[in-house]
């Protein structure tokens, strides 16, 4: 009897409301034992995959997604899955990025810390009412 | 191009049992893809039964269906559906279907013609 | 147990018309709601994922939109060939609390 894989999760650092410009960090969780994570926007036909995946803590491994300067293009649902052989994982459930314009007021938050979307709780309901479908149709397109 | 394709349906007596085959072509199972089963009585409307996970083989079903239908994959491209103690009500179409390649949020655009399973004395 | 409650039963519009149709999930789901057509003696056809976004091929005279775990399809501007049955469905597969369950179904009929 093969084990079964958890339902990985995902969630952004500093969190998942960012001033443009800004820097953004996925980080993906799994078991240990995981070769390679995949951070999927808006379906399995637009990812980025790495390798570089280390040990957060006895039973969990995670991989860190960054990116630099964020774009109004980087908004929008992403999800994680990994590969352990010889088999892939389901997907997290998604988590919504939201890119806001840089206000430069003093009461504005930069962002909205403490996002995340875990591997039991049902569907996460921090995805917005609508949203514009991401790079439809395209295959195995790097996400930056 | 790829497809799935129901195969299996007869007629069957109450209390007896089926196993339905979902044959897929033009895609590979160990990409992850949840293939679901989806019943539409005669003139009713459809009805989830379940969903395979096909890398991970996590399954799901529905409360109604759990003990009497069992879903497995079988090989690398077929996943089978186990009808048990059949009854009038379970006479309907049968439905493969995949969820989407290029779309998030799982939804089914890869669907079969469907297998008419039958149950009459 | 999820259940997804599709209004109304049926609906029938003249062409050029417009039909809505709603459909309200017992629970949270966030955005995994499909909408689907099928016509007599044929498989579904996948019209809107993801609550509001168009599948490939599919006239922008449908609309999917939602308000917590309430999701509404509009059609606008109907034609002959929108005649057929729609249904809503979860497409979350992920615990033990959703499925992957249908609304009853709505029948659209073209004067």
């Known amino acids: 009897q093969e084990e079964d894989l958890p339902r990985p999760s995902i969630s952004a650092e500093p969190g998942t409301v960012i001033p443009l410009g800004s820097h953004v960090t996925f980080v993906c969780r799994g078991p240990v034992g995981v070769q390679t994570f995949r951070l999927e926007r808006e379906s399995r036909s637009t990812y980025n995959d790495t390798e570089d995946v280390s040990q957060a803590s006895p039973s969990e491994s995670e991989a860190r997604f960054r990116i630099d300067s964020v774009s109004e293009g980087n908004a929008g649902p992403y999800r994680c899955i990994y590969y352990k052989p010889p088999k892939w994982s389901e997907q997290s459930d998604y988590l919504e990025l939201l890119v806001k314009e840089t206000s430069g007021g003093p009461d504005s938050p930069d962002t909205e810390p403490g996002s995340s979307a875990g591997p039991t709780q049902r569907p996460s309901d921090n995805s917005h009412n609508e949203h514009a479908p991401a790079s439809q149709g395209l295959k195995a397109e790097h996400l930056y | 191009e790829q497809s799935v394709e129901e195969s299996g349906g007869d007629l069957v007596k109450p209390e007896g049992s089926l196993t339905l085959t979902c044959t897929a072509s033009?895609?590979?199972?160990?990409?992850?893809?949840?293939m679901c089963w989806v019943r539409q009585a005669p003139g009713k409307g459809l009805e989830w039964i379940g969903c395979?996970?096909?890398?991970?083989?996590?399954i799901y079903y529905a409360s109604w269906a759990k003990g009497r239908f069992t879903i497995s994959k079988t090989s690398s491209t077929t996943v089978d559906l186990q009808l048990t103690s059949l009854t009038a009500a379970d006479t309907a179409t049968y439905f493969c279907?995949?969820?989407?390649?290029?779309?998030?949020?799982?939804?089914?655009?890869?669907w079969g013609p469907g297998t008419l399973v039958t149950v009459s004395s | 147990e999820l259940d997804m409650t599709q209004t109304p039963a049926s609906v029938s519009e003249p062409v050029g018309g417009t039909v809505t149709i709603k459909c309200q999930a017992s629970?949270?789901?966030?955005?995994?709601l499909a909408w689907y057509q099928q016509k007599p003696g044929q498989r579904p056809k996948l019209l809107i994922y993801?609550?509001?976004n168009l599948a490939s091929g599919v006239s922008s005279r449908f609309k999917g939109s939602r308000s917590g775990t309430q999701f509404t399809l509009t059609i606008t501007d109907l034609e002959c060939d929108d005649a057929a049955t729609y249904y809503c469905?979860?497409?979350?597969?992920?615990?033990?609390?959703?499925?992957?369950?249908f609304g009853g179904g709505t029948e659209v009929v073209v004067k």
């Open positions: 629970q949270s789901i966030s955005s995994y």
């Open positions: 993801g609550a509001s």
């Open positions: 395979i996970h096909s890398s991970s083989g996590n």
């Open positions: 033009g895609f590979s199972f160990s990409s992850g893809y949840y």
């Open positions: 279907a995949r969820d989407s390649e290029v779309y998030g949020w799982n939804p089914n655009d890869l």
């Open positions: 469905q979860c497409s979350y597969y992920g615990n033990s609390y959703v499925g992957g369950a």
